[in-house]
């Protein structure tokens, strides 16, 4: 059957149908819905919200909705022996304790099981000594305290502030650095936008504010104890000593009155220059320890915080595919929040919500898919994307078969300025094409296209005309499906403007204050934001799973094939002396992007003209297209990541959040001048390159012709 | 065979201009990324500046809002605008494909 034998309506009427059917208001009440109480994973609430989901997606029409559970390791404060920092003097004595809570924001304060700032999956510990301010705590930063400044943070407890890099990482670079202890806060510089009053009045960061959040290095292991399989009934666990990416030293996050305690008393160095200094008034000295007065003062931690194997439950909806049942386009975000979710996650499920009342309306009206849709309500993504990877591990035969796309749906927005999207360059025109068909939802752009504003607010930085797509690095639920297993992956939300608002994130992610108010009075009160990132993700979702031929256009993956050459080309060559001594080459990989690019470009011609009547050719060709993200997985992994898979993308070694292009090559010239065995060093990057290019060859050739 | 030949060296006075080319043969110029590099006397190799295949341009600190590569894929030829000159500008250099693959270079005195 054709699809439009198989769906009884004309594709145009059905996309329209189906985006006209998304309402602004049902996104609202969806949100209000999902933001009263708290949805930790592992609780009650939240197993309660998984069957209320299940039971409202079965009744918008999905053909199944069921809940798959895991037993994976969580992490809890301890109820009764609360976590905090203090400073003691020379006698012992706790002079100054940090909060044991967020004060509750207005309308909340009879909430209970409001989960107390935490980093998830801190050991247990008490250390005490002499404070080491470290400013973000990225690998720069240290390189700057040790290399430049010969300050040795062996056996101090540091002090970071959040923001610019995944909190992982810096818990990671203190250890590596012989921190006993981390001590993270959110700095105003970062956190606290000028002109902006904090929660309840406006969308600030209050002083007693705290962002939660795990510290793991799980490097897309997901459940801790279950490396590579799912933490099933009959699952082995590994013991505690040989989980995978648990920090080993005491980390606790404060929020900045807190953090104005402990800095403004801090001595030794001065700040190296001032990018170190945040907004608080202190001197941002670096330590270590405490200024002449009080230098026989320390700072003490006490954590109690117990890690847990606790049941987690997704929730999967299935609409099934009319004529290709065995193709799996998939909408997934998570269901899990830290408290309220008022941005994380509920605006991206609410949004996720609304999509599947919108399909299962259309569903009701006897029209399906041409391939199967799955909506996914993952858990425990905030312990570190735990619901998602689990599934992922128990599903993957069919999903490395099967799969021809994840859309993400974490938080809809991060701000109300524009859109921003990260994906792979299979879907650069998908994302394009669809967003000049939408609406654009920005003042001073009306009747203009969603393309339009977003390529005016965000241009490309390469093609003028253009708006700016990101890589996608990790930190969300895509992280298994896009890494690990190779499907095409994207993700698509409202974001800030960068130029002119500096801070991390946005402020109040991951406190108590991310509330259903704070999104309905201060982010988007006409929810015509959310409204549009529904579209664009439903549209990607529907265009994915209903085009004859896969909206994938492999031509642009040669374009930026070309680019990330180019670029880890230009980061070798820093090196003219060792790439001359050990005679590296790139010829190689510039002719792996060569024969790709001309490849690409033949099957693109043949795309156009072959007949798509004939159900196997077309099949045939959706295959190659379905196939080709899948091409540059390499089996055995990345170096010591052996779950990040994919050649040309990982998230960055130095930052989860950020994607990394050629991180194999990049990770062996990283740093390579200290390197104390050079020959081997450059072994490495030599051995990297030729895994770069036999994996872009090797993707080139499942393009050709077939025989 | 690869080859690579510079041209375009010489001596001249600080604060004025040269254009450094080279013209390479032996492989597809236009699909293969190229630098500059250079030594200066006394010293290690220094990179001085990267062209991509797909164009986009990469500069050492030293010569940034200085220096300008450029290339004609046309003509096999990839160029250096040196402006700006500085006595420590004065080096041999070096046309290079990577590691393995260096043209003889020419050589650039910046002097009064």
């Known amino acids: 059957k054709s699809s439009n034998e198989a769906t009884n309506i004309t594709p145009k009427h059905n996309m329209k149908a189906f985006l006209d059917e998304l309402k602004a208001e049902n996104i609202k009440k969806f949100l209000y819905n999902f933001t009263q109480i708290p949805h930790l994973a592992g609780t009650e609430q939240n197993f309660q919200l998984a069957k209320q989901i299940q039971s409202q997606w079965k009744e918008f029409g999905l053909d199944s909705v069921e809940l798959a559970h895991y037993d994976v390791l969580l992490s809890y404060p301890n109820k009764t022996h609360p976590n905090y920092i203090s400073i003691i003097n020379e006698d012992g004595n706790e002079i100054f304790n940090t909060s044991l809570f967020e004060p509750p924001p207005p309308g909340y304060e009879n909430v209970s099981d409001i989960v107390p700032p935490f980093s998830a999956f801190s050991p247990q510990g008490m250390p005490e000594g002499d404070l080491v301010y470290v400013n973000y705590a990225r690998t720069e930063d240290f390189f700057k305290l040790e290399r430049d400044m010969k300050i040795n943070c062996s056996g101090k407890i540091v002090i970071a502030r959040y923001g610019k890099v995944f909190r992982g990482n810096k818990v990671k670079n203190a250890q590596l650095a012989g921190a006993k202890g981390v001590i993270l806060y959110s700095d105003p510089a970062d956190y606290f936008a000028p002109g902006v009053k904090s929660y309840p009045d406006g969308w600030n960061l209050p002083g007693g504010g705290v962002q939660r959040g795990n510290i793991l290095n799980l490097n897309g292991a997901g459940d801790p104890l279950t490396p590579g399989y799912p933490a099933n009934e009959y699952a082995y666990r590994r013991g505690i000593a040989e989980a995978v990416g648990l920090p080993s030293i005491p980390v606790h996050p404060i929020g900045y009155y807190d953090a104005q305690k402990l800095l403004e008393k801090m001595g030794g160095s001065a700040p190296p220059d001032s990018s170190w200094r945040g907004s608080l008034k202190v001197p941002y000295n670096v330590g270590p320890g405490f200024t002449g007065n009080f230098s026989t003062q320390k700072v003490k931690m006490h954590i109690h915080s117990t890690n847990e194997v606790t049941r987690i439950y997704n929730v999967i909806g299935t609409l099934r595919g009319a004529v290709e049942p065995d193709r799996y386009v998939i909408l997934g975000g998570h269901r899990d929040s830290w408290v309220f979710g008022g941005i994380d996650p509920q605006s991206g499920a609410a949004v996720v919500h609304e999509i599947v009342r919108s399909f299962g309306t259309l569903k009701k009206e006897g029209w399906r898919p041409r391939r199967t849709i799955l909506f996914a309500s993952w858990d425990a993504e905030e312990f570190g994307l735990l619901g998602s990877t689990e599934w992922a591990e128990e599903n993957s035969r069919l999903l490395q078969e099967r799969g021809v796309a994840y859309i993400n749906a974490d938080s809809s927005i991060e701000g109300n300025y524009t859109l921003r999207v990260d994906c792979t360059p299979l879907m650069y025109s998908l994302v394009h094409n669809l967003t000049k068909e939408l609406k654009s939802p920005d003042e001073g752009f009306e009747g203009k296209s969603l393309y339009e504003s977003w390529t005016k607010k965000s241009p490309s930085p390469e093609f003028s005309g253009m708006p700016r797509i990101s890589k996608l690095g990790s930190g969300n639920d895509f992280e298994v499906f896009f890494q690990r297993l190779g499907i095409a992956s994207g993700r698509a939300r409202y974001t800030k403007n960068w130029e002119t608002n500096k801070f991390s994130g946005y402020p109040l992610y991951h406190s108590v204050y991310e509330t259903y108010e704070l999104v309905e009075k201060f982010y988007d009160p006409m929810f015509k934001y959310h409204l549009t990132v529904a579209q664009v993700r439903g549209g990607m979702v529907f265009e994915l799973a209903n085009s004859i031929v896969l909206p994938f256009d492999c031509r642009d993956y040669a374009v930026v094939l070309r680019k990330y050459a180019d670029k880890i080309y230009s980061i070798s060559m820093k090196h003219p002396q060792e790439m001359k001594t050990y005679s590296v080459s790139f010829d190689s990989l510039f002719s792996a992007v060569k024969n790709f690019t001309e490849i690409a470009s033949k099957f693109s011609e043949r795309l156009q003209d072959f007949d798509k009547s004939n159900p196997i050719v077309l099949r045939m060709m959706n295959d190659q297209l379905m196939f080709l993200e899948r091409a540059f997985i390499d089996p055995l992994g990345l170096p010591d990541r052996p779950f990040y898979r994919h050649v040309i993308y990982a998230p960055s070694s130095h930052n989860k959040y950020a994607g990394e292009s050629f991180p194999g090559i990049y990770d062996a010239l990283f740093d390579i001048e200290s390197k104390v065995d050079p020959s081997k060093a450059w072994g490495e990057v030599k051995r990297q390159i030729y895994v770069a290019a036999f994996t872009v060859q090797a993707a080139a050739e499942t393009l050709s012709e077939v025989a | 065979e690869v080859q690579l030949v510079e041209s375009g060296g010489g001596l001249v006075q600080p604060g004025g201009s040269l254009r450094l080319s080279c013209t390479v043969s032996g492989f597809t110029f236009s699909s293969y990324a190229v630098s500059w590099v250079r030594q200066a006397p006394g010293q290690g190799l220094e990179w001085v500046s990267s062209?991509?295949?797909?164009?986009?341009?990469y500069y050492a600190d030293s010569v940034k809002g200085r220096f300008t590569i450029s290339r004609d894929n046309s003509k096999n030829t990839l160029y250096l605008q040196m402006n700006s000159l500085r006595a420590e500008d004065t080096a041999v250099y070096y046309c290079a494909k990577d590691g393995a693959d260096w043209g003889q270079g020419t050589l650039v005195t910046v002097s009064s």
């Open positions: 062209i991509g295949a797909g164009g986009g341009t």
